[in-house]
Amino acid sequence: DWVVAPISVPENGKGPFPQRLNQLKSNKDRDTKIFYSITGPGADSPPEGVFAVEKETGWLLLNKPLDREEIAKYELYGHAVSENGASVEEPMNISIIVTDQNDNKPKFTQDTFRGSVLEGVLPGTSVMQVTATDEDDAIYTYNGVVAYSIHSQEPKDPHDLMFTIHRSTGTISVISSGLDREKVPEYTLTIQATDMDGDGSTTTAVAVVEILDANDNAPMFDPQKYEAHVPENAVGHEVQRLTVTDLDAPNSPAWRATYLIMGGDDGDHFTITTHPESNQGILTTRKGLDFEAKNQHTLYVEVTNEAPFVLKLPTSTATIVVHVEDVNEAPVFVPPSKVVEVQEGIPTGEPVCVYTAEDPDKENQKISYRILRDPAGWLAMDPDSGQVTAVGTLDREDEQFVRNNIYEVMVLAMDNGSPPTTGTGTLLLTLIDVNDHGPVPEPRQITICNQSPVRQVLNITDKDLSPHTSPFQAQLTDDSDIYWTAEVNEEGDTVVLSLKKFLKQDTYDVHLSLSDHGNKEQLTVIRATVCDCHGHVETCPGPWKGG
């Protein structure tokens, strides 16, 4: 029959070429001479001429060695024609299967593989996976079946079999306990991939296993005892730098130190922070220390890490003896801010108050006083006694110096230490109001029509405080009441001025006397411009401008 079974041809054939594969034969050759040809990739299309057929004999020939990894199967068609060129058979499929030879070594996908595993892990922990490929066939043969193995391990500490590799998957795992980053931070494994499932060609690569740090080392104080001297009252003062050593990976949470004052700081005077580079503990004062109260503090500081320990480890403790040094302390006014009520306008020389300071130092030091800031220059202070007296008129209504009835003065106390120190105090004089100002109308100029005039409402102001203000009373003087009337409203804080008789257009003085609740009287002259007009007006119409 005009059929050819699939032809198997081993790759890398040594020839000689042309090499016979099979003979195409049509049984029609009994009747007529048959000519044979082949078509398809590998024959008449790329890669051309790999296969040929002898036209008269039908012998199928291979002209070159085949490479399965390039082309694993060729599909050709055989043709049979008579001498006149007429087809005598249907085109026949010719399958040429290239059988594999173990002509490729395994190839690792990388020259160097990198993986990592935590120190101290249990055997069986997976580290990494390596991969090698082999272009040969791994389905029908073992030519491309890769088996992995570890050829060598460097260093060989604690022994030479710390890792194993799964022969099929290439997964590298820990096989022994004892991985210790502080002793061996990195292992270099020479790994092998061997085809034929371990019996063929071998290639090698390197697997670098980084041993990751676990917090299996506690930080240790070195030294464990410290003595420090600190001047009293210093806040944020660096008392001592505490040094620790930690075998774990520098700058990791397992290495970075965390300090804790375990004892000796009942008054919460100290704080300890970690220096970001050196890892030292920086002990500083949170509050000023008081030599007079306690001249020595013994602190107990414990050190741990940012990361928790992976196993139970003893914690290291340091002892710091802090000696407080005496300094000449400034006198302190008691209270630091003193509020005194005093009536405004008291006579010059009148005492205001006594304001003194105390010296924290144990020895009795002489304190002298002076005024540091007295904006209006109203006061004087006795240097020995701290007696404050009035030397000017205290004016509650002086808006330049008095805010919310309070006049603020800063005083200074100086001791006779060497060198002398000073302290300041604030004297807040609350000025008590007296009725020293009369009521004043606003505005003091008005314009009004002489026909159907509109009532003029004037606001009344008084610089004093209640009860030296409203209700106010109004009275017109100097014959102003002939033409005008003045009435205080019900609330008592405005006065209504009305024109009650016709006045010709001109400017007039209206004499208005206002008195407050304490009968303090104030006379004010209102300039009234009367215009020839009806009702409401702001300026006189026409050419007249007033005068």
Epitope: P16, F17, P18, G49, A52, E54, T57
Partner: antibody, heavy 118, light 107 residues
Framework: VQLVEESGGDLVKPGGSLKLSCAAS????????MSWVRQTPDKRLEWVAT????????YYPDSVKGRFTISRDNAKNTLYLQMSSLKSEDTAMYYC???????????WGQGTTVTVSS | ELQMTQSPSSLSASLGERVSLTCRAS??????LNWLQQKPDGTIKRLIY???SLDSGVPKRFSGSRSGSDYSLTISSLESEDFGDYYC?????????FGAGTKLEIK
Amino acid sequence: VQLVEESGGDLVKPGGSLKLSCAASGFTFSTYGMSWVRQTPDKRLEWVATISSGGHYSYYPDSVKGRFTISRDNAKNTLYLQMSSLKSEDTAMYYCASYYYGSPFAYWGQGTTVTVSS
Amino acid sequence: ELQMTQSPSSLSASLGERVSLTCRASQDIGSSLNWLQQKPDGTIKRLIYDTSSLDSGVPKRFSGSRSGSDYSLTISSLESEDFGDYYCVQYGSSPLTFGAGTKLEIK
């Protein structure tokens, strides 16, 4: 009737070059592999070169590799052998022969003589 | 390189006599062996291919056979036109190699 006829043989100095031709007739030249074979003066036969039917692939023994080149022109039914860097041991009668039934040296020409001598 | 050892190197025989020529292959070549005949005028002709297949136009008195690595050409009854040189050639291994030849003469 299958016929092959060689030509181009000559006397040539060592290191020289020569091109032999082989004209084929009586068979479908383009579908057969072709070879050159030489017979040395001591009558020993030696394979020199083979080329595939389409001319895509060629093969040589180590003795001539790099010096001889086999080629063919199927349109002209002609086989060639370009010889260069000739040596005295290349002196021989050169035959061209065709494959047939997938087997070498089926049809032979009369041969052409190549003499390499100074 | 595969060696073909041909024997005898020369042979005298009478007309009608049965003669056998032998080639021994140094390696396995399967059935990839041809026998060639060269006439005194230098004309070369293939007699047998694939160890035992007779080329068209070759008389049936010629036959080829194989026994292991020994390959034989037998002429059952010598005729006058059979005299000349005979060569074996193998094509089972590269490079193709020839036997040294057997000179067949009339006794």
